[in-house]
């Protein structure tokens, strides 16, 4: 089931997925002056079985000069309404991470791909937020948003990330030393976190991120 909306926008923050659930689609977008090859895939699709997941199809871009145009290839109107953009990719290298059943890693860049990746996320997808350069989070721990299905409608949970002040750059997991175990709102030290997604391993990995207090939901 595709998520209807984009992940929430947080002031002075960007989001990134550590891995992508099966069913996720990534548009094959080319940078200006290039286009998809003839009969090329419109998108890559995360598929697989319980033991292994990978991206089906390959995105390929070719110069559009032969067509005497520099117009960028964009999705058709019916595709457009489902566009999900990750602001982080430009493009990203795969993140070194544990293999998650039913999830694909970040696809490697393809030649002449667009600077912005457009994903079509599915229910259960989790994305992580960090403050942009020059801003710093008020709280520590992963700020995450999950696409959930409620009463037949999809919605993203709201990360309580507050990015403030002209501070040093914050990093994504794996790019700075670990800080603290992931926390949500101040929860009793003897009680369990209320994060119940199959992404718990990713929550552990994202513990290096500086984020905020509501990383686990009230329930």
């Amino acid at each position: 089931e595709l998520c209807d909306d984009d992940p929430p926008e947080i002031p002075h923050a960007t989001f990134k997925a550590m891995a992508y659930k099966e069913g996720t689609m990534l548009n094959c977008e080319c940078k200006r002056g290039f286009r998809r090859i003839k009969s090329g895939s419109l998108y890559m699709l995360c598929t697989g079985n319980s033991s292994h997941s990978s991206w089906d199809n390959q995105c390929q871009c070719t110069s559009s000069a032969t067509r005497n145009t520099t117009k960028q290839v964009t999705p058709q109107p019916e595709e457009q309404k489902e566009r999900k953009t990750t602001e982080m990719q430009s493009p990203m290298q795969p993140v070194d991470q544990a293999s998650l059943p039913g999830h694909c890693r970040e696809p490697p860049p393809w030649e002449n791909e667009a600077t912005e990746r457009i994903y079509h996320f599915v229910v259960g997808q989790m994305v992580y937020y960090q403050c942009v350069q020059g801003y710093r989070a008020l709280h520590r721990g992963p700020a995450e948003s999950v696409c959930k299905m409620t009463h037949g409608k999809t919605r993203w949970t709201q990360p309580q990330l507050i990015c403030t002040g002209e501070m040093e750059t914050s990093q994504f997991p794996g790019e700075e030393k670990p800080q603290a175990s992931p926390e949500g709102r101040p929860e009793s030290e003897t009680s369990c976190l209320v994060t119940t997604t199959d992404f718990q391993i990713q929550t552990e990995m994202a513990a290096t991120m500086e984020t905020s207090i509501f990383t686990t939901e009230y329930q």
Partner: antibody, heavy 114, light 111 residues
Framework: EVQLLESGGGLVQPGGSLRLSCAAS????????MHWVRQAPGKGLEWVSV????????YYADSVKGRFTISRDNSKNTLYLQMNSLRAEDTAVYYC???????WGQGTLVTVSS | QSVLTQPPSASGTPGQRVTISCTGS?????????VHWYQQLPGTAPKLLIY???ERPSGVPDRFSGSKSGTSASLAISGLRSEDEADYYC???????????FGGGTKLTVL
């Protein structure tokens, strides 16, 4: 259970100083930004100051800038507010709060009067 | 003067639905920051009632709901009860102050 317990309030003369403390328990104190919020008698809530989880940055309301200092000791799970050059208009119940803020202490009364 | 604007008072009879508004600016609510609502019963500390515009902490009845649009937000209380008589405050982060700002508070009276 999350608990925030303020102390250090009392009666002080204008121009005097006080140091408020807030003892936190029931959560990982060192992971959260902390606030001081005050409420003058019969009035609304007024944010005073915030400190990041590691104490690396602090912000203050204009009304207290240069007179109040927020600090924290993560090894003691304690938040502080050093209040100098106190004025009559600083009279209020002072609450310490965690996060959004979503958890609040019960408050400590500061009275500035001659 | 508070940065967020709320009506000073609101009232309703038991069972009724009441709405409290909260208006901000482009540096707080309009900048994309979430709105949170607090309930303060007489003589007690504020308690978080709604977070992230429309989410309820555990223990808060579903009679309480929140919404946000543009530079304003609102709190709705349906099926009003006598124990809802309290002061209600909205709050949001303000990027120009680097701290949360509060509304002036709305005193709710259950007639």
């Amino acid at each position: 259970e999350v608990q925030l317990l303020e102390s250090g309030g009392g009666l002080v003369q204008p121009g005097g100083s006080l140091r408020l403390s807030c003892a936190a328990s029931g959560f990982t104190f060192s992971s959260y930004g902390m606030h001081w919020v005050r409420q003058a008698p019969g009035k609304g809530l007024e944010w005073v100051s915030v400190i990041s989880y590691d104490g690396s940055y602090k912000y203050y309301a204009d009304s207290v800038k240069g007179r109040f200092t927020i600090s924290r000791d993560n090894s003691k799970n304690t938040l502080y507010l050093q209040m100098n050059s106190l004025r009559a208009e600083d009279t209020a119940v002072y609450y310490c709060a965690a996060g959004v803020p979503d958890y609040w202490g019960q408050g400590t009364l500061v009275t500035v009067s001659s | 003067q508070s940065v967020l604007t709320q009506p000073p008072s609101a009232s309703g009879t038991p069972g009724q639905r009441v709405t409290i508004s909260c208006t901000g600016s482009s540096s707080n609510i309009g900048a994309g920051y979430d709105v949170h609502w607090y309930q303060q019963l007489p003589g007690t500390a504020p308690k978080l009632l709604i977070y992230s515009n429309n989410e309820r902490p555990s223990g808060v009845p579903d009679r309480f709901s929140g919404s946000k649009s543009g530079t304003s937000a609102s709190l709705a209380i349906s099926g009003l009860r006598s124990e809802d008589e309290a002061d209600y405050y909205c709050a949001a982060w303000d990027i120009s102050l680097n701290g949360p700002v509060f509304g002036g508070g709305t005193k709710l009276t259950v007639l």
